[in-house]
Protein backbone atom coordinates (compact mmCIF):
# COMPACT_ATOMS: atom_id res chain seq x y z
CA UNK A 1 0.00 0.00 0.00
CA UNK A 2 1.45 3.44 -0.95
CA UNK A 3 2.49 5.63 1.99
CA UNK A 4 0.40 8.63 3.05
CA UNK A 5 3.17 10.21 5.11
CA UNK A 6 6.96 10.12 4.96
CA UNK A 7 9.85 10.21 7.41
CA UNK A 8 11.76 13.36 8.32
CA UNK A 9 13.91 14.66 5.41
CA UNK A 10 11.61 12.94 2.94
CA UNK A 11 8.66 14.08 0.83
CA UNK A 12 5.73 12.32 -0.76
CA UNK A 13 5.44 12.33 -4.54
CA UNK A 14 3.66 9.92 -6.92
CA UNK A 15 2.70 7.76 -3.91
CA UNK A 16 6.37 7.40 -3.04
CA UNK A 17 8.68 8.78 -0.34
CA UNK A 18 11.69 10.59 -1.81
CA UNK A 19 14.68 12.02 0.04
CA UNK A 20 14.78 15.80 0.32
CA UNK A 21 17.88 17.61 -0.94
CA UNK A 22 20.27 18.70 1.81
CA UNK A 23 20.93 22.41 2.53
CA UNK A 24 23.13 23.88 -0.19
CA UNK A 25 21.59 21.69 -2.91
CA UNK A 26 18.54 21.98 -5.18
CA UNK A 27 16.26 19.35 -6.68
CA UNK A 28 17.02 18.17 -10.22
CA UNK A 29 14.70 15.16 -10.38
CA UNK A 30 12.40 13.29 -8.03
CA UNK A 31 13.20 9.75 -7.06
CA UNK A 32 11.49 6.85 -8.79
CA UNK A 33 10.95 3.24 -7.88
CA UNK A 34 14.45 2.59 -9.23
CA UNK A 35 16.42 5.83 -8.67
CA UNK A 36 17.32 8.15 -5.79
CA UNK A 37 16.37 11.82 -5.66
CA UNK A 38 18.84 13.77 -7.80
CA UNK A 39 20.21 16.99 -6.27
CA UNK A 40 22.75 19.54 -7.47
CA UNK A 41 24.82 22.07 -5.46
CA UNK A 42 23.64 25.69 -5.53
CA UNK A 43 25.86 27.96 -7.60
CA UNK A 44 28.57 30.10 -6.00
CA UNK A 45 26.26 33.10 -5.46
CA UNK A 46 23.20 31.15 -4.27
CA UNK A 47 22.00 29.23 -1.22
CA UNK A 48 19.32 26.97 0.26
CA UNK A 49 19.28 26.81 4.05
CA UNK A 50 16.91 23.88 4.65
CA UNK A 51 16.32 20.29 3.57
CA UNK A 52 14.25 20.99 0.50
CA UNK A 53 12.67 20.08 -2.83
CA UNK A 54 13.29 23.48 -4.42
CA UNK A 55 14.22 23.47 -8.09
CA UNK A 56 15.97 26.85 -7.80
CA UNK A 57 18.36 28.18 -5.18
CA UNK A 58 17.96 31.69 -3.69
CA UNK A 59 20.36 34.46 -4.67
CA UNK A 60 22.63 35.72 -1.92
CA UNK A 61 21.65 39.12 -0.60
CA UNK A 62 23.94 41.91 -1.83
CA UNK A 63 25.23 44.32 0.80
CA UNK A 64 25.37 47.36 -1.49
CA UNK A 65 28.09 49.78 -0.30
CA UNK A 66 26.22 52.60 -2.09
CA UNK A 67 23.44 52.12 0.46
CA UNK A 68 25.89 52.18 3.37
CA UNK A 69 25.79 48.39 3.72
CA UNK A 70 28.68 46.07 4.42
CA UNK A 71 29.02 42.30 4.81
CA UNK A 72 28.78 40.96 8.35
CA UNK A 73 28.86 37.31 7.26
CA UNK A 74 29.62 36.03 3.76
CA UNK A 75 26.95 33.95 2.08
CA UNK A 76 27.59 30.23 1.64
CA UNK A 77 25.73 27.51 -0.25
CA UNK A 78 23.76 26.88 2.97
CA UNK A 79 23.37 30.38 4.40
CA UNK A 80 22.47 33.82 3.07
CA UNK A 81 24.78 36.81 3.29
CA UNK A 82 24.18 38.89 6.42
CA UNK A 83 24.50 42.64 5.98
CA UNK A 84 25.16 45.35 8.53
CA UNK A 85 25.75 49.09 8.25
CA UNK A 86 28.95 51.05 8.01
CA UNK A 87 30.15 53.01 11.04
CA UNK A 88 27.85 55.90 11.91
CA UNK A 89 24.84 54.21 10.27
CA UNK A 90 22.24 51.64 11.32
CA UNK A 91 19.74 49.38 9.53
CA UNK A 92 16.28 50.72 8.72
CA UNK A 93 14.69 47.27 9.19
CA UNK A 94 15.43 43.82 10.57
CA UNK A 95 16.34 42.56 7.09
CA UNK A 96 18.84 45.45 6.81
CA UNK A 97 18.14 46.51 3.21
CA UNK A 98 19.43 50.05 3.73
CA UNK A 99 21.07 52.31 6.31
CA UNK A 100 20.46 55.72 7.86
CA UNK A 101 22.71 57.90 10.05
CA UNK A 102 22.55 57.46 13.82
CA UNK A 103 20.50 60.17 15.49
CA UNK A 104 22.16 62.57 17.92
CA UNK A 105 20.74 63.37 21.32
CA UNK A 106 19.90 67.10 21.53
CA UNK A 107 21.02 69.42 24.37
CA UNK A 108 19.12 68.44 27.50
CA UNK A 109 19.29 64.78 26.50
CA UNK A 110 22.09 62.23 26.90
CA UNK A 111 22.91 58.93 25.26
CA UNK A 112 21.33 56.02 27.14
CA UNK A 113 22.50 53.43 24.58
CA UNK A 114 25.03 53.98 21.80
CA UNK A 115 23.84 52.98 18.33
CA UNK A 116 25.12 49.83 16.63
CA UNK A 117 25.03 48.66 13.00
CA UNK A 118 21.50 47.41 13.62
CA UNK A 119 20.00 49.80 16.22
CA UNK A 120 19.68 53.57 16.56
CA UNK A 121 20.90 55.76 19.42
CA UNK A 122 18.61 55.73 22.47
CA UNK A 123 18.39 59.11 24.22
CA UNK A 124 17.15 59.98 27.71
CA UNK A 125 16.30 63.34 29.31
CA UNK A 126 18.99 64.57 31.68
CA UNK A 127 17.59 64.24 35.24
CA UNK A 128 17.97 66.93 37.90
CA UNK A 129 21.65 67.24 38.76
CA UNK A 130 22.78 66.37 35.23
CA UNK A 131 23.10 68.27 31.94
CA UNK A 132 24.11 67.99 28.30
CA UNK A 133 24.96 71.13 26.33
CA UNK A 134 25.81 69.36 23.06
CA UNK A 135 24.07 67.46 20.28
CA UNK A 136 25.85 64.09 20.29
CA UNK A 137 25.46 60.42 19.39
CA UNK A 138 27.94 59.42 22.10
CA UNK A 139 27.83 61.74 25.12
CA UNK A 140 25.90 60.83 28.27
CA UNK A 141 24.36 63.41 30.59
CA UNK A 142 27.11 64.84 32.79
CA UNK A 143 26.71 65.70 36.49
CA UNK A 144 26.62 69.33 37.51
CA UNK A 145 29.90 70.58 38.93
CA UNK A 146 30.02 70.31 42.73
CA UNK A 147 30.92 73.84 43.82
CA UNK A 148 31.30 72.77 47.46
CA UNK A 149 34.21 70.42 46.76
CA UNK A 150 36.08 73.38 45.27
CA UNK A 151 35.26 75.65 48.24
CA UNK A 152 33.02 77.68 45.96
CA UNK A 153 29.32 78.48 45.95
CA UNK A 154 26.67 78.19 43.28
CA UNK A 155 26.32 81.53 41.53
CA UNK A 156 23.98 80.30 38.81
CA UNK A 157 21.80 77.22 39.04
CA UNK A 158 22.28 74.41 36.51
CA UNK A 159 19.61 73.22 34.09
CA UNK A 160 19.28 70.10 31.98
CA UNK A 161 21.25 71.99 29.29
CA UNK A 162 23.77 73.95 31.34
CA UNK A 163 26.20 73.33 34.16
CA UNK A 164 26.03 75.27 37.40
CA UNK A 165 28.24 78.36 37.57
CA UNK A 166 30.45 78.43 40.67
CA UNK A 167 31.89 81.54 42.27
CA UNK A 168 33.85 82.60 45.34
CA UNK A 169 32.09 82.59 48.70
CA UNK A 170 30.82 86.04 49.87
CA UNK A 171 33.26 86.62 52.80
CA UNK A 172 31.34 89.71 54.16
CA UNK A 173 28.44 87.43 55.10
CA UNK A 174 30.66 85.12 57.18
Amino acid sequence: EPPTACREKQYLINSQCCSLCQPGQKLVSDCTEFTETECLPCSESEFLDTWNRETRCHQHKYCDPNLGLQVQQKGTSETDTICTCEEGLHCTSESCESCVPHRSCLPGFGVKQIATGVSDTICEPCPVGFFSNVSSAFEKCRPWTSCETKDLVVQQAGTNKTDVVCGPQDRQRA
Partner: antibody, heavy 116, light 113 residues
Amino acid sequence: EVQLVESGGGLVKPGGSLKVSCAASGFTFSDYGMNWVRQSPEKGLEWIAYISSGRGNIYYADTVKGRFTISRDNAKNTLFLQMTSLRSEDTAMYYCARSWGYFDVWGTGTTVTVSS
Amino acid sequence: DIVMTQSPSSLTVTAGEKVTMSCKSSQSLLNSGNQKNYLTWFQQKPGQPPKLLIYWASTRESGVPDRFTGSGSGTDFTLTISSVQAEDLAVYYCQNDYTYPLTFGAGTKLELK
Protein backbone atom coordinates in the same frame (compact mmCIF):
# COMPACT_ATOMS: atom_id res chain seq x y z
CA GLU B 1 43.37 21.35 -16.93
CA VAL B 2 42.01 24.22 -14.82
CA GLN B 3 44.12 27.31 -15.47
CA LEU B 4 44.18 31.03 -14.72
CA VAL B 5 46.72 33.22 -16.54
CA GLU B 6 47.17 36.91 -15.70
CA SER B 7 48.57 39.49 -18.12
CA GLY B 8 48.89 43.26 -18.53
CA GLY B 9 51.22 44.07 -15.66
CA GLY B 10 54.09 46.49 -16.08
CA LEU B 11 55.72 49.73 -14.99
CA VAL B 12 53.45 52.74 -14.51
CA LYS B 13 53.97 56.21 -13.06
CA PRO B 14 52.17 57.37 -9.89
CA GLY B 15 48.71 58.68 -10.80
CA GLY B 16 48.66 56.50 -13.91
CA SER B 17 46.30 53.72 -14.99
CA LEU B 18 46.64 50.08 -15.95
CA LYS B 19 44.26 47.25 -16.86
CA VAL B 20 45.23 43.69 -16.00
CA SER B 21 43.45 40.60 -17.28
CA CYS B 22 42.99 37.00 -16.21
CA ALA B 23 42.21 34.34 -18.84
CA ALA B 24 40.41 31.28 -17.49
CA SER B 25 40.31 27.83 -19.06
CA GLY B 26 39.42 24.24 -18.16
CA PHE B 27 36.25 25.06 -16.19
CA THR B 28 32.88 26.80 -16.56
CA PHE B 29 34.05 30.34 -15.80
CA SER B 30 30.53 31.79 -15.35
CA ASP B 31 29.80 29.37 -12.47
CA TYR B 32 32.53 30.79 -10.23
CA GLY B 33 33.14 33.89 -8.18
CA MET B 34 36.42 35.56 -9.09
CA ASN B 35 38.84 37.60 -7.01
CA TRP B 36 41.95 39.73 -7.27
CA VAL B 37 44.57 39.27 -4.55
CA ARG B 38 47.90 41.07 -4.49
CA GLN B 39 51.15 40.32 -2.69
CA SER B 40 54.02 42.59 -1.76
CA PRO B 41 56.91 42.21 0.72
CA GLU B 42 55.52 45.17 2.70
CA LYS B 43 51.87 44.17 2.98
CA GLY B 44 51.95 40.40 2.38
CA LEU B 45 48.83 38.84 0.83
CA GLU B 46 46.01 41.33 0.40
CA TRP B 47 42.57 40.57 -1.05
CA ILE B 48 41.41 43.55 -3.12
CA ALA B 49 38.24 42.69 -5.06
CA TYR B 50 35.54 40.06 -5.67
CA ILE B 51 32.91 39.63 -8.37
CA SER B 52 30.25 36.95 -7.97
CA SER B 53 28.88 34.55 -10.53
CA GLY B 54 25.26 35.21 -11.44
CA ARG B 55 24.32 38.85 -10.89
CA GLY B 56 27.93 39.98 -10.63
CA ASN B 57 27.80 41.39 -7.09
CA ILE B 58 31.03 43.24 -6.31
CA TYR B 59 33.01 43.95 -3.13
CA TYR B 60 36.27 45.89 -2.77
CA ALA B 61 38.90 46.39 -0.10
CA ASP B 62 38.85 49.96 1.28
CA THR B 63 42.43 50.51 0.05
CA VAL B 64 41.31 50.34 -3.61
CA LYS B 65 37.66 51.43 -3.43
CA GLY B 66 36.97 54.21 -5.94
CA ARG B 67 40.25 53.62 -7.78
CA PHE B 68 40.01 50.01 -9.00
CA THR B 69 37.19 48.33 -10.93
CA ILE B 70 36.70 44.58 -11.20
CA SER B 71 34.70 43.21 -14.15
CA ARG B 72 34.23 39.98 -16.05
CA ASP B 73 33.37 38.86 -19.57
CA ASN B 74 31.81 35.40 -19.26
CA ALA B 75 31.64 34.99 -23.05
CA LYS B 76 35.41 35.41 -23.25
CA ASN B 77 36.21 33.61 -19.95
CA THR B 78 38.14 36.66 -18.80
CA LEU B 79 38.40 38.65 -15.57
CA PHE B 80 39.63 42.26 -15.53
CA LEU B 81 40.99 44.76 -13.04
CA GLN B 82 41.06 48.37 -14.14
CA MET B 83 43.42 50.35 -11.91
CA THR B 84 43.48 54.16 -11.82
CA SER B 85 45.17 56.81 -9.64
CA LEU B 86 47.95 54.31 -8.96
CA ARG B 87 50.22 54.83 -5.96
CA SER B 88 53.63 53.43 -5.06
CA GLU B 89 51.94 51.22 -2.43
CA ASP B 90 50.00 49.48 -5.24
CA THR B 91 53.29 47.91 -6.37
CA ALA B 92 52.77 44.15 -6.05
CA MET B 93 52.29 40.81 -7.72
CA TYR B 94 48.61 40.62 -8.76
CA TYR B 95 46.89 37.22 -8.72
CA CYS B 96 43.42 36.26 -9.87
CA ALA B 97 41.80 33.51 -7.81
CA ARG B 98 38.68 31.47 -8.43
CA SER B 99 36.26 30.94 -5.56
CA TRP B 100 33.30 28.79 -4.67
CA GLY B 101 33.36 29.70 -1.00
CA TYR B 102 37.18 29.58 -0.87
CA PHE B 103 40.11 30.31 -3.20
CA ASP B 104 40.73 26.91 -4.77
CA VAL B 105 42.67 27.94 -7.89
CA TRP B 106 45.16 30.80 -8.30
CA GLY B 107 46.82 32.25 -11.38
CA THR B 108 50.59 32.57 -11.71
CA GLY B 109 50.43 36.35 -11.24
CA THR B 110 51.42 39.53 -13.07
CA THR B 111 53.74 42.17 -11.64
CA VAL B 112 52.63 45.79 -11.35
CA THR B 113 55.28 48.39 -10.47
CA VAL B 114 54.28 51.97 -9.69
CA SER B 115 57.32 54.23 -9.81
CA SER B 116 58.41 57.55 -11.28
CA ASP C 1 38.42 44.28 9.66
CA ILE C 2 39.31 40.84 11.02
CA VAL C 3 42.98 40.65 11.97
CA MET C 4 44.69 37.29 11.46
CA THR C 5 47.70 36.65 13.70
CA GLN C 6 50.04 33.76 12.91
CA SER C 7 52.74 32.32 15.14
CA PRO C 8 55.54 31.60 15.08
CA SER C 9 56.71 33.75 12.15
CA SER C 10 59.30 31.07 11.30
CA LEU C 11 60.02 27.47 12.26
CA THR C 12 63.23 25.52 11.74
CA VAL C 13 62.59 21.79 11.57
CA THR C 14 64.16 18.50 10.67
CA ALA C 15 62.60 16.05 8.21
CA GLY C 16 60.20 13.64 9.90
CA GLU C 17 59.43 16.04 12.73
CA LYS C 18 55.85 16.94 13.76
CA VAL C 19 55.08 20.64 13.34
CA THR C 20 52.21 22.80 14.56
CA MET C 21 51.55 26.42 13.72
CA SER C 22 48.91 28.74 15.11
CA CYS C 23 46.47 31.22 13.62
CA LYS C 24 44.25 33.48 15.72
CA SER C 25 41.48 35.72 14.39
CA SER C 26 40.31 38.93 16.06
CA GLN C 27 36.69 37.73 15.84
CA SER C 28 34.93 34.39 15.49
CA LEU C 29 34.95 32.76 12.05
CA LEU C 30 32.12 30.37 12.98
CA ASN C 31 29.05 30.65 10.77
CA SER C 32 26.15 29.98 13.17
CA GLY C 33 23.87 29.02 10.26
CA ASN C 34 25.83 25.92 9.22
CA GLN C 35 28.31 25.54 12.11
CA LYS C 36 31.32 25.74 9.79
CA ASN C 37 34.44 27.76 10.52
CA TYR C 38 35.45 29.88 7.53
CA LEU C 39 39.20 29.60 7.98
CA THR C 40 41.45 28.58 5.08
CA TRP C 41 45.11 27.48 5.00
CA PHE C 42 47.44 28.01 2.02
CA GLN C 43 50.97 26.87 1.24
CA GLN C 44 53.25 29.08 -0.85
CA LYS C 45 56.60 28.04 -2.25
CA PRO C 46 59.11 30.59 -3.64
CA GLY C 47 58.13 31.92 -7.05
CA GLN C 48 54.72 30.21 -6.97
CA PRO C 49 51.19 31.36 -6.16
CA PRO C 50 49.55 30.19 -2.92
CA LYS C 51 48.08 26.68 -3.02
CA LEU C 52 44.91 25.67 -1.16
CA LEU C 53 45.55 23.11 1.60
CA ILE C 54 42.62 23.25 4.04
CA TYR C 55 39.20 24.94 3.95
CA TRP C 56 36.42 25.19 6.55
CA ALA C 57 39.22 24.96 9.15
CA SER C 58 39.63 21.19 8.85
CA THR C 59 38.60 19.94 5.37
CA ARG C 60 41.60 18.85 3.33
CA GLU C 61 41.58 19.87 -0.34
CA SER C 62 41.69 16.88 -2.68
CA GLY C 63 45.23 15.82 -3.51
CA VAL C 64 46.68 17.29 -0.31
CA PRO C 65 48.65 14.66 1.66
CA ASP C 66 46.98 13.47 4.87
CA ARG C 67 50.01 14.55 6.93
CA PHE C 68 48.40 18.03 6.79
CA THR C 69 45.64 18.51 9.37
CA GLY C 70 43.65 21.62 10.22
CA SER C 71 41.85 22.04 13.53
CA GLY C 72 40.28 24.67 15.77
CA SER C 73 37.09 26.68 16.02
CA GLY C 74 35.94 30.24 16.64
CA THR C 75 39.09 32.32 16.89
CA ASP C 76 41.88 29.74 17.49
CA PHE C 77 43.15 27.50 14.70
CA THR C 78 46.07 25.16 14.14
CA LEU C 79 47.77 23.60 11.14
CA THR C 80 49.68 20.40 11.93
CA ILE C 81 52.13 18.57 9.68
CA SER C 82 52.54 15.12 11.22
CA SER C 83 55.89 14.31 9.59
CA VAL C 84 57.55 17.15 7.68
CA GLN C 85 58.99 16.34 4.26
CA ALA C 86 61.57 18.40 2.35
CA GLU C 87 58.86 19.44 -0.15
CA ASP C 88 56.83 21.01 2.70
CA LEU C 89 59.34 23.84 3.11
CA ALA C 90 57.27 26.90 2.29
CA VAL C 91 55.35 29.78 3.85
CA TYR C 92 51.94 28.86 5.31
CA TYR C 93 49.16 31.43 5.41
CA CYS C 94 45.78 31.37 7.14
CA GLN C 95 42.89 33.41 5.78
CA ASN C 96 39.58 34.74 7.07
CA ASP C 97 36.93 33.58 4.61
CA TYR C 98 34.09 34.56 6.93
CA THR C 99 33.54 38.18 5.91
CA TYR C 100 34.78 40.99 3.69
CA PRO C 101 37.40 42.25 3.56
CA LEU C 102 38.94 38.79 3.31
CA THR C 103 42.17 38.98 5.31
CA PHE C 104 45.35 36.93 5.52
CA GLY C 105 47.85 36.26 8.27
CA ALA C 106 51.49 37.34 7.80
CA GLY C 107 52.53 33.71 7.38
CA THR C 108 54.68 31.09 9.08
CA LYS C 109 57.90 30.22 7.23
CA LEU C 110 58.95 26.59 7.49
CA GLU C 111 62.71 26.11 7.10
CA LEU C 112 64.91 23.05 7.19
CA LYS C 113 67.59 22.68 9.87
